[in-house]
């Protein structure tokens, strides 16, 4: 009886199980009883990242810097090329089609994990005894002033967006 | 035990036609794919045509193709080749061959084909 | 086609020798090659399968190497009944092709 299934890296076809291209390679003929599959590699500018039976390669992906795009990895006749974001922006998605300014995190909050190309500005809001006072991608929140050591003493509480105010002690009070 | 007997050669004129058979006997004949190939004398060897296997394509040379027509007949358990517009580039002895994973693991002994005036 | 072509055509070597040929195909054909052993008057006979797979019943004594373009068949010791013409066969392109063929005679 001629096969119903084939092996792993095979495809049927006219009751004969036939051998899948490689990757980067594009099918040109199917096999025969006499014959292998024939198989032709991927231009430069193109892919194939599976075993396969396609008759045409994928192009690799365009990194447009006009969408503030760059090539992070060149492809290859097996992986499609890899972008990435130009510096300060970062991918709108996965596939990273296109990128957006990194987000700054407003006084009050801090910056939790800096942007990459791929992912954008995480922020935080500066916990009791830290403060942010500007709108920043970079900035972490900063601890208040610690008047005590400086031999001051507090003469304005510190909020989430401003530094303590240190003053001298009152020498009245000693 | 496998044996492969060919038969139907003989000599022909230029122009005509032969019919050659192949008696197949000792595994089961549909299940294989079939082939011709045939060695000029003093020359090597020539793919000349082949069939699949359950009533599979035919396959033929460039330089037989449109003259030479390959069958086979399950039931009879044998392959033919019919051959029309003989020419003298076409002697040779023909042998017919079982294919296995693309190679002829089982060939017949031959049958001399000669095209001459 | 896919022109094979084989070398040396022909060679003298005597019993006991080390004995290789050489077949290179026009273009790639991956492992896809056979080679066939062929005495006077005899059919051929199948002896090596996708380049380096030794076909059932044939000595230790003969192997198969290469990929791509070119490939050697190899008899490690000559015996007095290897005296034959070999042919290599190439499947991976429509239609299959034989070289020239390698004649080994008695030195």
């Known amino acids: 009886e001629p096969p119903t299934a084939c092996r792993e890296k095979q495809y049927l076809i006219n009751s004969q199980c036939c051998s899948l291209c490689q990757p980067g390679q594009k099918l040109v003929s199917d096999c025969t009883e006499f014959t292998e599959t024939e198989c032709l590699p991927c231009s430069e500018s193109e892919f194939l990242d599976t075993w396969n039976r396609e008759t045409r390669c994928h192009q690799h992906k365009y990194c447009d810097p006009n969408l503030g795009l760059q090539v992070q990895q060149k492809g290859t006749s097996e992986t499609d090329t890899i972008c990435t974001c130009e510096e300060g922006l970062h991918c709108t998605s996965e596939s990273c089609e296109s990128c957006v300014p990194h987000r700054s995190c407003l006084p009050g909050f801090g910056v939790k994990q800096i942007a990459t190309g791929v992912s954008d500005t995480i922020c935080e809001p500066c916990p009791v005894g830290f403060f942010s006072n500007v709108s920043s991608a970079f900035e972490k929140c900063r601890p208040w002033t610690s008047c005590e050591t400086k031999d001051l003493v507090v003469q304005q509480a510190g909020t989430n967006k401003t530094d303590v105010v240190c003053g001298p002690q009152d020498r009245q009070r000693a | 035990e496998v044996q492969l007997l060919e038969s139907g050669g003989g000599l022909v004129q230029p122009g005509g036609s032969l019919r050659l058979s192949c008696a197949a006997s000792?595994?089961?004949?549909?299940?294989?794919?079939m082939s011709w190939v045939r060695q000029a004398p003093g020359k090597g060897l020539e793919w000349v045509s082949g069939?699949?296997?359950?009533?599979?394509?035919?396959y033929y040379a460039d330089s037989v193709k449109g003259r030479f027509t390959i069958s086979r007949d399950n039931s009879k358990n044998t392959l033919y080749l019919q051959m029309n517009s003989l020419r003298a580039e076409d002697t040779a002895v023909y042998y017919c061959?079982?294919?296995?994973?693309?190679?002829?693991?089982?060939w017949g002994q031959g049958t001399l084909v000669t095209v001459s005036s | 086609d896919i022109q094979m072509t084989q070398s040396p055509s022909s060679l003298s070597a005597s019993v006991g020798d080390r004995v290789t040929i050489t077949c290179r195909a026009s273009?790639?054909?991956?492992?896809?090659l056979n080679w066939y052993q062929q005495k006077p008057g005899k059919a051929p006979k199948l002896l090596i399968y996708?380049?380096?797979s030794l076909q059932s019943g044939v000595p230790s004594r003969f192997s198969g190497s290469g990929s791509g373009t070119d490939f050697t068949l190899t008899i490690s010791s000559l015996q007095p009944e290897d005296f034959a013409t070999y042919y290599c066969?190439?499947?991976?392109?429509?239609?299959?092709?034989f070289g020239q063929g390698t004649k080994l005679e008695i030195k």
């Open positions: 996708a380049a380096s």
């Open positions: 069939i699949g296997s359950y009533g599979g394509g035919t």
């Open positions: 066969q190439q499947y991976g392109r429509n239609p299959p092709t």
């Open positions: 273009q790639s054909i991956s492992s896809y």
């Open positions: 061959a079982r294919y296995v994973n693309f190679g002829m693991d089982y």
């Open positions: 000792g595994f089961t004949f549909s299940s294989y794919a």
